[in-house]
Amino acid sequence: EVEKTACPSGKKAREIDESLIFYKKWELEACVDAALLATQMDRVNAIPFTYEQLDVLKHKLDELYPQGYPESVIQHLGYLFLKMSPEDIRKWNVTSLETLKALLEVNKGHEMSPQVATLIDRFVKGRGQLDKDTLDTLTAFYPGYLCSLSPEELSSVPPSSIWAVRPQDLDTCDPRQLDVLYPKARLAFQNMNGSEYFVKIQSFLGGAPTEDLKALSQQNVSMDLATFMKLRTDAVLPLTVAEVQKLLGPHVEGLKAEERHRPVRDWILRQRQDDLDTLGLGLQGGIPNGYLVLDLSMQEALS
C-alpha cells in the first residue's frame, strides 16, 4: 500500500510513457491518473516497469474499477493478468476471443494457473458453449484442456467444434469423457468416406459401442494395437474372432504381446479356443472345445 501524497510540481503524467520508470512508487500513485492509465494500458506492455511499480498500477485500476475491469482494459493487461486473483477475474465479462488469446499468451509455456482456469470458465460460460474457434484457441495453448473438462461440461461442445480437436488433445481423456465425445465426433465426420472417416474418428474410438466396432470391421481399416487397447472392454467383448481379425488386419499379430492386458485378456476369455487357434498366434485362455456357453443375461431377459 502506497501512502497518499500530493504529486510534486511538474510531475503529473500526461501520458503513459518510459519516463514513468523513473518515478518512485509514491510518485506513480500520486501522479498517474487512473483513467489515463486505463485508456493507455496498451502502452504499459512496452515499458519495462519493476514488479513493485506494476503493483501500484494494478492498485490504481482496482480503485477505479471496484466492480471489475472493462474488457478494453482486460485485453491490454499483459503481465498484470498474472497478478489478478481468481476473485478479481470472476468480476470480469470477457466476450472477445482476441482478449482471451492475449491473456493466454502471457501465461504461455506455463501450467494452467488458477487465473487462467477462471478466465476460461468465465469466457465459456459467457458464450454458452464451447464453439469451434474457442476450442481451437484453448487446445492450441493447452493440449490437455479438453480432458480437463467433466462429462457434463463436454456435453456443451457442439459437434462442429470436434473438427478442431487433434489426437494429442485426447491423450489424457478417460473413458467417461470419450463416451461423451465419440457420438459428437461420429456426427461431425459422418459425411466422410471410409478411410478418411477412420483417420478422423480413430482418436475418439475409446467411446465407441460394439455395433460401431462391428461396422468398422467390415471396412478394412487396419486398426493399430494402441487404438485397440484403448477401446471400451464392454464394447470389445462381444466381437467375434473373425471381426477382431478384420478390424486389426495385419496388426492382429500384436494381440499375442497384449494377451495379458485388458481388453485383450478379457476378450480371449470369451472366445472359443478353436476360434482363437485359427489366428495362429498361440493365444491361450479361450473356452475349451465341447463346453457350452450360456449367456445368462439373455436368459433373464427372455424370462
Partner: nanobody, 115 residues
Amino acid sequence: LQLVESGGGLVQPGGSLRLSCAASGFTLDNYAIGWFRQAPGKEREGVSSISSSGGSTNYADSVKGRFTVSRDNAKHTVCLQMNSLKPEDTAVYYCAGVGDYGRRAMGQGTSVTVS
C-alpha cells in the same frame, strides 16, 4: 522468465564499470529493458531504459551524461556503461524487461560499490 545481471564490483570514484543483462532460457531481442538500482535502506529507482529496437533510450537525471545503455544483438545482451562513478552510485543494479504480450522478466541484481 529470468534475467541475469553481471559486471558489478568495487571501483574507485571517477572509475568505470560495464554491466550486462542477459536472458536465461529465452532471447532478449524483442524485450524493452530497464535498469534499476537499490541502495541500502532506500527504495529501488529507475536508472535507464532502452526500447526493443534500441532506437529509444531514457535516463534518470542523476545519471545523464555519465551512463549509456545499449543493445549488443550479437550477444543478445543489454549493457549499461557507467562512467565517472560517484559514491552515491553504490547500489545493487537490476535489469527488468518486457516483451511480446506484456511478458515480464527481472533479474536478481549485481552489486556495485564506489569507494
